[in-house]
Interface confidence: low
Amino acid sequence: FERTRSLQDPCSNCPAGTFCDNNRNQICSPCPPNSFSSAGGQRTCDICRQCKGVFRTRKECSSTSNAECDCTPGFHCLGAGCSMCEQDCKQGQELTKKGCKDCCFGTFNDQKRGICRPWTNCSLDGKSVLVNGTKERDVVCGPSPADLSPGASSVTPPAPAREPGHSPQ
């Protein structure tokens, strides 16, 4: 009996964008303003996310999907679904608990986010420094001194920088 009753549950007929209203004989009522249901058979609608303050609206809430937020200029998203906004810094800086700080000598950051990373040690690859590093840029490694002869290969470009704060998912 229980199984039969659950198979005939009238709430299962309520589509996304509605909820099964127990106060009205389990009929399907539209989600109220500023709420949504993304799946059928819901007994309540969820409150829409509000993108306030440092968050701004990337996608408006609809009756079937939540709002999506991103961050105002000067900030970037962190966390699943942009649950947090973190302050941007300038290239050549990293964000600390006390705000943006310049990269220490020997480190660089070519992004507006993430941390300062050490310059590449060219000598580990048997190469020499062709262009010195700065707070904003890694060193450029060149051919080893022994290779500096006619017909030697061209300069090795630095590896592309990663964005530490960016989720690969």
Partner: antibody
Framework: EVQLVETGVEVKKPGASVKVSCKAS????????MHWVRQAPGQGLEWMGI????????SYAQKFQGRVTMTRDTSTSTAYMELSSLRSEDTAVYYC???????????????????????WGKGTMVTVSS | QSALTQPASVSGSPGQSITISCTGT?????????VSWYQQRPGKAPKLIIY???TRPSGVSNRFSGSKSGTTASLTISGLQAEDEADYYC??????????FGGGTKLTVL
């Protein structure tokens, strides 16, 4: 004194759900993120997820997506962690742990949790057995 | 997201210094300065001893220190004492917007 008090021992059957509570006292509950961490017997620590008690926003470890729900009741300064479809591998001590950093309202400010867990509950032992 | 790699056990005599390593990837330890260390004694909840790679919470002995190089973080305990015998765990924020712990290291004071 700042402390987190969790529910006692829970014994559940496979397939059931468990809801663990964590009552905070001695600080402003809505100003600090809360993490949930579990530890199976003789094993290491495993991060499950985080909730911002101010706005109720959550982020879960991929392993628990779809099975875990973290909620809070600001009127009682209590955080909850519900885990469904329990299996024997879920037998563990479940800890709530406060994030060290002081947060801002999720909807009006910005804040990155430090991920340093400075205050821990004593843990709730959940045993899943048929 | 895989657990960070820690040695299963380390040991040292009273008065000595020991170092516990915690190796991750550029997506966690190497990408952020959000590395923490915890001490856990048997039957107890973990206790925060280092956060933000190098910072000690108030009340934690200055015998505990943290550092990081590349994708490996380290916890050093100097002037080892019998009461330091415990399990130690590292953790890090990750680019997947989550946190991950190390497998834990059992410290034995000989």
């Amino acid at each position: 004194e700042v402390q987190l008090v969790e529910t006692g021992v829970e014994v559940k059957k496979p397939g059931a759900s468990v809801k663990v509570s964590c009552k905070a006292s001695g600080y402003t509950f809505t100003s600090y993120y809360m993490h949930w961490v579990r530890q199976a017997p003789g094993q290491g620590l495993e991060w499950m997820g985080i909730i911002n008690p101010s706005g109720g926003s959550t982020s879960y470890a991929q392993k628990f997506q779809g099975r875990v729900t973290m909620t809070r009741d600001t009127s009682t300064s209590t955080a909850y962690m519900e885990l469904s479809s329990l299996r024997s591998e879920d037998t563990a001590v479940y800890y709530c742990a406060r994030d060290l950093g002081e947060g801002y309202d999720f909807w009006s400010g910005y804040y990155t949790p430090s991920g340093a867990f400075d205050i821990w509950g004593k843990g709730t032992m959940v045993t899943v057995s048929s | 997201q895989s657990a960070l790699t820690q040695p299963a056990s380390v040991s040292g005599s009273p008065g000595q210094s020991i170092t516990i390593s915690c190796t991750g990837t550029s997506s966690d330890v190497g990408g952020y300065n959000y590395v923490s260390w915890y001490q856990q004694r048997p039957g107890k909840a973990p206790k925060l001893i280092i956060y933000d790679v190098t910072t000690r919470p108030s009340g934690v002995s200055n015998r505990f220190s943290g550092s990081k190089s590349g994708t490996t973080a380290s916890l050093t305990i100097s002037g080892l004492q019998a009461e330091d015998e415990a399990d130690y765990y590292c953790s890090s924020y990750t680019s997947y917007s989550t946190w991950v712990f190390g497998g834990g290291t059992k410290l034995t004071v000989l």
